[in-house]
């Protein structure tokens, strides 16, 4: 994901009689004007703000990368939601890209969890039931569940 959020610039509101503790803030979907007097709408499909704020600019909408699908579009109050395409997933420790799911489990392991947009297939040792978190096995390592039947690919 290429998150192009602008730095959330804040400003000090001019000294003036305040009617409430939060006067000088603008609602979600808006940002504050340079002089602090007005609230300006974010531009639909271009930028957004999610909370009451005193940002000088709305935040730029994320564009989904190739290899991602758009689950929901950017509105003035919510950023785009992108998800990895079928057969790929995004790891917490490398959220910048979608990685291909493994097609099967290493020898001596069975698949207990399918490929999802947020996780690889899950494999456990046949006997102990402990999880395996190694690299994708080489093709020849892929086990067959029973003679002549390959382990199910991730759906």
């Amino acid at each position: 994901i290429t998150q192009q959020d602008l730095a959330p610039q804040q400003r000090v509101a001019p000294q003036q009689k305040r009617s409430s503790p939060s006067e000088g803030l603008c609602p979600p979907g808006h940002h504050i004007s340079e002089d602090g007097r007005d609230c300006i709408s974010c531009k639909y499909g271009q930028d957004y703000s999610t909370h009451w704020n005193d940002l000088l600019f709305c935040l730029r909408c994320t564009r989904c990368d190739s290899g991602e699908v758009e689950l929901s579009p950017c509105t003035t109050t919510r950023n785009t939601v992108c998800q990895c395409e079928e057969g790929t997933f995004r790891e917490e420790d490398s959220p910048e890209m979608c990685r291909k799911c493994r097609t099967g489990c290493p020898r001596g392991m069975v698949k207990v969890g399918d490929c999802t947009p947020w996780s690889d297939i899950e494999c456990v040792h046949k006997e102990s039931g402990t999880k395996h978190s190694g690299e994708a096995p080489a093709v020849e390592e892929t086990v067959t569940s029973s003679p002549g039947t390959p382990a199910s690919p991730c759906s």
């Epitope: 009617s19 409430s20 503790p21 939060s22 006067e23 803030l25 609602p27 979600p28 979907g29 808006h30 004007s33 007005d38 609230c39 300006i40 709408s41 531009k43 639909y44 009451w52 509105t75 003035t76 109050t77």
Partner: antibody, heavy 119, light 107 residues
Framework: QVQLVQSGAEVKKPGASVKVSCKAS????????LHWVRQAPGQGLEWMGW????????KYNEKFKDRVTITADKSTSTVYMELSSLRSEDTAVYYC????????????WGQGTLVTVSS | DIQMTQSPSFLSASVGDRVTITCKAS??????VAWYQQKPGKAPKLLIY???TRHTGVPSRFSGSGSGTDFTLTISSLQPEDVATYYC?????????FGGGTKLEIK
């Protein structure tokens, strides 16, 4: 269903103040911004200001800033608009209206309160 | 403040006619325009927001278009119940402002 029920018509003398109420029901009071919009007889609509019960944020149209006060009683889900130093040109129907915390359009309106300023 | 100029201010049309009301903003408001219908003695009702998005329950004969400074409300086939005054509103920058209204009647 969503309802915004306003107080009854008022007749006031020039220089006096008026306080109009708007009781909200049918939705979570703290999730929407409530506004006051007025309409002079045979005229267009004029936005006066907002109150957001979620954080007590208030914003006024500069035109009314010195004379209008918007308050709320969260225990009764009621918003009030007080306009002071009334003049004849303040004779109008005063509406409360709500909008989601997002774009500033109004999806539900109260029935309106006629305020007549006459000596 | 942004001025919203509506035209015409009065419009007479026949049932079944295609009716167009225009609204011009004094400066760029992107697509942040809403349209309301107001019947005599009643509060306004939201028809369109973001220039072209129909509000829930609004008949499909009502449509909106435009961006920047020029906006249009169209009724594709006028019905007797459409007799009302129509207002545009910019929700781009506070203070939010309304057009002067277009009173629509049946010929």
């Amino acid at each position: 269903q969503v309802q915004l029920v306003q107080s009854g018509a008022e007749v006031k003398k020039p220089g006096a103040s008026v306080k109009v109420s708007c009781k909200a029901s049918g939705y979570t009071f703290t999730e929407y911004i409530l506004h006051w919009v007025r309409q002079a007889p045979g005229q267009g609509l004029e936005w006066m200001g907002w109150f957001y019960p979620g954080n007590n944020n208030i914003k006024y149209n500069e035109k009314f800033k010195d004379r209008v006060t918007i308050t709320a009683d969260k225990s009764t889900s009621t918003v009030y608009m007080e306009l002071s130093s009334l003049r004849s040109e303040d004779t109008a129907v005063y509406y409360c209206a709500r909008h989601e915390q997002g774009p500033g359009y109004f999806d539900y309106w109260g029935q309106g309160t006629l305020v007549t300023v006459s000596s | 403040d942004i001025q919203m100029t509506q035209s015409p201010s009065f419009l007479s049309a026949s049932v079944g006619d295609r009716v167009t009301i225009t609204c011009k903003a004094s400066q760029d408001v992107n697509t942040a325009v809403a349209w309301y219908q107001q019947k005599p003695g009643k509060a306004p009702k939201l028809l369109i927001y973001w220039a072209s998005t129909r509000h829930t329950g609004v008949p499909s004969r009502f449509s909106g278009s435009g961006s920047g400074t020029d906006f249009t409300l169209t009724i594709s086939s006028l019905q007797p119940e459409d007799v009302a005054t129509y207002y545009c509103q910019q929700h781009y920058i506070t203070p939010w402002t309304f057009g002067g209204g277009t009173k629509l009647e049946i010929k």
